[in-house]
Amino acid sequence: KESCDVQLYIKRQSYHSIFAGDPFKLECPVKYCAHRPQVTWCKLNGTTCVKLEGRHTSWKQEKNLSFFILHFEPVLPSDNGSYRCSANFLSAIIESHSTTLYVTDVKSASERPSKDEMASRPWLLYS
């Protein structure tokens, strides 16, 4: 029997290497059965996750999954950091793993580095 618990499909220790000035969509895949839960995004500040208010978000529906999307229009250097989505379901809070955005400022990089370089050259990243 398929579980009817809400599940949030963000991989543990996932990350995205992105560039300041570009648009970016951060997706939180949500599985639910009958009623779509209320989902929010927060950004980690140490051990506290600060809810993101007044940001552009949207839903995208696919066959077996819905996606709660946080829009970056455009990405700013200050968007660097870790994010988590949470679902409010039957008065319980379900939290996703955090996912990290590594933002490169294209002004300080002569050319866009590869994904592998992004992971291995932290001096290119904002901390």
Partner: antibody, heavy 119, light 112 residues
Framework: EVQLVESGGGLVQPGRSLRLSCTAS????????MYWVRQAPGKGLEWVGR????????RYTASFKGRATISADGSKSIAYLQMNSLKTEDTAVYYC????????????WGQGTLVTVSS | DIQMTQSPSSLSASVGDRVTITCRSS???????????LNWLQQKPGKAPKRLIY???KLDSGVPSRFSGSGSGTDFTLTISSLQPEDFATYYC?????????FGQGTKLEIK
């Protein structure tokens, strides 16, 4: 049932390159992380690196950076390990493994493929 | 890198014995989500390793209940409550909290 089959091992001369393949079945690899571990004869386990097949992002142990490249083809459910500038000390059984990226609910290893670096 | 130190390196025991293997990490394995990503593997000669335990104490499906894991922070143990003939193998701990992933050097469990 999740299963992995490795291929591509064998005898290779020092200084040459080799590409190992790891074919997964029973799982959508985009929901997983796939990683490579090696074991020299009679020795312990050494983590080479991993890939997120959903986006191609990789992580490596420092000693393998620049010499090892892990890649994946989600549509074919295959992960690859390319090793360049092989040395005799790279002789080992190379294992690929896969685990659930969301809940760690499974972690399955392939049978391993022996790479012998010798002239 | 996190160093993983297992003890003992080898161990002789008899069928029916209770056996404990310890694993110590050079820094805490407690992740930001409050979980410790410590795994135990079993490897038999000529075979691939097989995960027995993950998240310190969760048993993989099909693993007999005589295996158990415990610990927190930097100190972890694998216990086999009553050794069976098929349990003679090499056991490895490894951490999945930080990159790069690192393994203990292994504990070879032999028949006395």
């Amino acid at each position: 049932e999740v299963q992995l089959v490795e291929s591509g091992g064998g005898l290779v001369q020092p200084g040459r390159s080799l590409r190992l393949s790891c074919t997964a079945s029973g799982v959508n690899i985009k929901d997983t992380y796939m990683y490579w571990v090696r074991q020299a004869p009679g020795k312990g386990l050494e983590w080479v690196g991993r890939i997120d097949p959903a986006n191609g992002y990789t992580r490596y142990t420092a000693s393998f950076k620049g010499r090892a490249t892990i890649s994946a083809d989600g549509s074919k459910s295959i992960a690859y390990l390319q090793m360049n500038s092989l040395k005799t000390e790279d002789t080992a059984v190379y294992y690929c493994a896969v685990y659930d990226g969301y809940y760690e609910s499974f972690d399955v290893w392939g049978q391993g493929t022996l790479v012998t670096v010798s002239s | 890198d996190i160093q993983m130190t297992q003890s003992p390196s080898s161990l002789s025991a008899s069928v029916g014995d209770r056996v404990t293997i310890t694993c110590r990490s050079s820094q805490s394995l407690l992740d930001s989500d409050g979980k410790s990503y410590l795994n135990w593997l079993q490897q038999k000669p000529g075979k691939a390793p097989k995960r027995l335990i993950y998240l310190v104490s969760k048993l993989d499906s099909g693993v007999p209940s005589r295996f158990s894991g415990s610990g927190s922070g930097t100190d972890f143990t694998l216990t086999i409550s009553s050794l069976q003939p098929e349990d003679f193998a090499t056991y490895y701990c490894w951490q999945g909290t930080l990159f790069p992933r690192t393994f203990g050097q292994g504990t070879k469990l032999e028949i006395k």
